[in-house]
């Protein structure tokens, strides 16, 4: 059972600061933006990150959504990383959720963050270079230390 | 009502592996709604979460000490146990047994309603 | 981890006062917030949960408001059975984490 408790709109940037933003395909994207960038491009680059309160004590549950024009929710549904349109559920009554990740610091670095999904136990977020493109995706944690895993989560509220 | 009763050794080597058991009586711990968890305090000190146990047996731990610890229960005993592994001094704390209201959207939940008395364990050769 | 911190430390006061201690949470903890009173050789034992809420058989000279990251735990009229150490704990979130603890002395 999870159940949502409070939100915060928040710029999500993975180590190399790149700013992840979702494109007018409804992408999750790493771009290089400044500050001025990543504001001009909003609400493209602000999160809204949904906590919730879990029946299970495994860390803070939160849900990643986006507000453009209708609001879009971060899924992993079989593995693949896309945003769906729907609203943050006020509760969810079941242990696992594509939607849910566990939001932690990383041992040794606050500021730095790892999701992990609620549905697939040892993947996490990730940023993967395919192309040109810095794309978000659900990777297995194969390595102690992958810094793809790492994210800095800036409050804007 | 529900108690608990902590019991084990009061004094381990450092290195050496602390174990102890905590006794519930006056219900069950394979009954649902509850975890079991164990609290520690060093000496004047303030209380430190180290982990709970679930009736179907899943463990959660604190991840400041989850390379070291484990939790299991014994339910033809109605006993939970810990176990924390290459201990030093630091480790030297009263540790308690404590019971957890379960959270399935409800209010009460997820503090410590029913504790044990403790028991100081000393880590010193 | 959610870090709790409360003030002040140490609080001195005197029967019949109104003592108020305070907690903060390092992030938003909803109304998840459980206050402890702790005295020397005993176990903790829960007085308020859900940050307001007060657990059966403890007396209504406790009471607990705040939500958010800012609590407080308010006594409205100091009892000798009192003096003891306060805790506040985050139970929004795991790992269960607690503020380092009030000590609450005659004055």
């Known amino acids: 059972y999870f159940g949502k408790l409070e939100s915060k709109l928040s710029v999500i940037r993975n180590l190399n600061d790149q700013v992840l933003f979702i494109d007018q395909g409804n992408r999750p994207l790493f771009e290089d933006m400044t500050d001025s960038d990543c504001r001009d491009n909003a609400p493209r680059t602000i999160f809204i990150i949904s906590m919730y309160k879990d029946s299970q004590p495994r860390g803070m549950a939160v849900t990643i959504s986006v507000k453009c024009e209708k609001i879009s929710t971060l899924s992993c549904e079989n593995k693949i990383i896309s945003f769906k349109e729907m609203n943050p559920p006020d509760n969810i009554k079941d242990t696992k959720s594509d939607i849910i990740f566990f939001q932690r610091s990383v041992p040794g670095h606050d500021n730095k963050m790892q999701f992990e999904s609620s549905s697939y136990e040892g993947y996490f977020l990730a940023c993967e270079k395919e192309r040109d493109l810095f794309k978000l995706i659900l990777k297995k944690e194969d390595e102690l230390g992958d810094r793809s895993i790492m994210f800095t989560v800036q409050n804007e509220d | 009502q529900v108690q608990l009763q902590e019991s084990g050794p009061g004094l381990v080597k450092p290195s050496e592996t602390l174990s102890l058991t905590c006794t519930v009586s006056?219900?069950?711990?394979?009954?649902?709604?509850?975890?079991w968890s164990w609290i520690r305090q060093p000496p004047g000190k303030g209380l430190e979460w180290i982990g709970s146990?679930?009736?179907?047996?899943?463990?959660y731990y604190n991840p400041s000490l989850k390379s070291r610890v484990t939790i299991s229960g014994d339910t033809s005993k109605n006993q939970f146990s810990l176990k924390l592994s290459s201990v030093t001094a630091a480790d030297t704390a009263v540790y308690y047994c404590?019971?957890?209201?379960?959270?399935?959207?409800?209010?009460?939940?997820?503090?410590?309603?029913?504790w044990g008395r403790g028991t100081l364990v000393t880590v010193s050769s | 981890d959610i870090q709790m911190t409360q003030s002040p430390s140490t609080l001195s006061a005197s029967v019949g006062d109104r003592v108020t201690i305070t907690c903060r949470a390092s992030?938003?903890?909803?109304?998840?917030l459980a206050w402890y009173q702790q005295k020397p050789g005993k176990a903790p034992k829960v007085l308020i949960y859900?940050?307001?809420t007060l657990e059966s058989g403890v007396p209504s000279r406790f009471s607990g408001s705040g939500s958010g990251t800012e609590f407080t735990l308010t006594i409205s009229s100091l009892q000798p059975d009192d003096f003891a150490t306060y805790y506040c704990a985050n139970i929004a979130f795991p790992p269960w984490t607690f503020g380092q603890g009030t000590k609450l002395e005659i004055k």
């Open positions: 146990i679930y009736y179907s047996g899943s463990t």
């Open positions: 992030q938003g903890i909803s109304s998840w």
């Open positions: 404590a019971r957890t209201p379960a959270y399935f959207g409800q209010d009460r939940t997820d503090f410590f309603d029913v």
């Open positions: 006056g219900g069950s711990i394979s009954s649902g709604g509850y975890y």
């Open positions: 859900k940050a307001s």
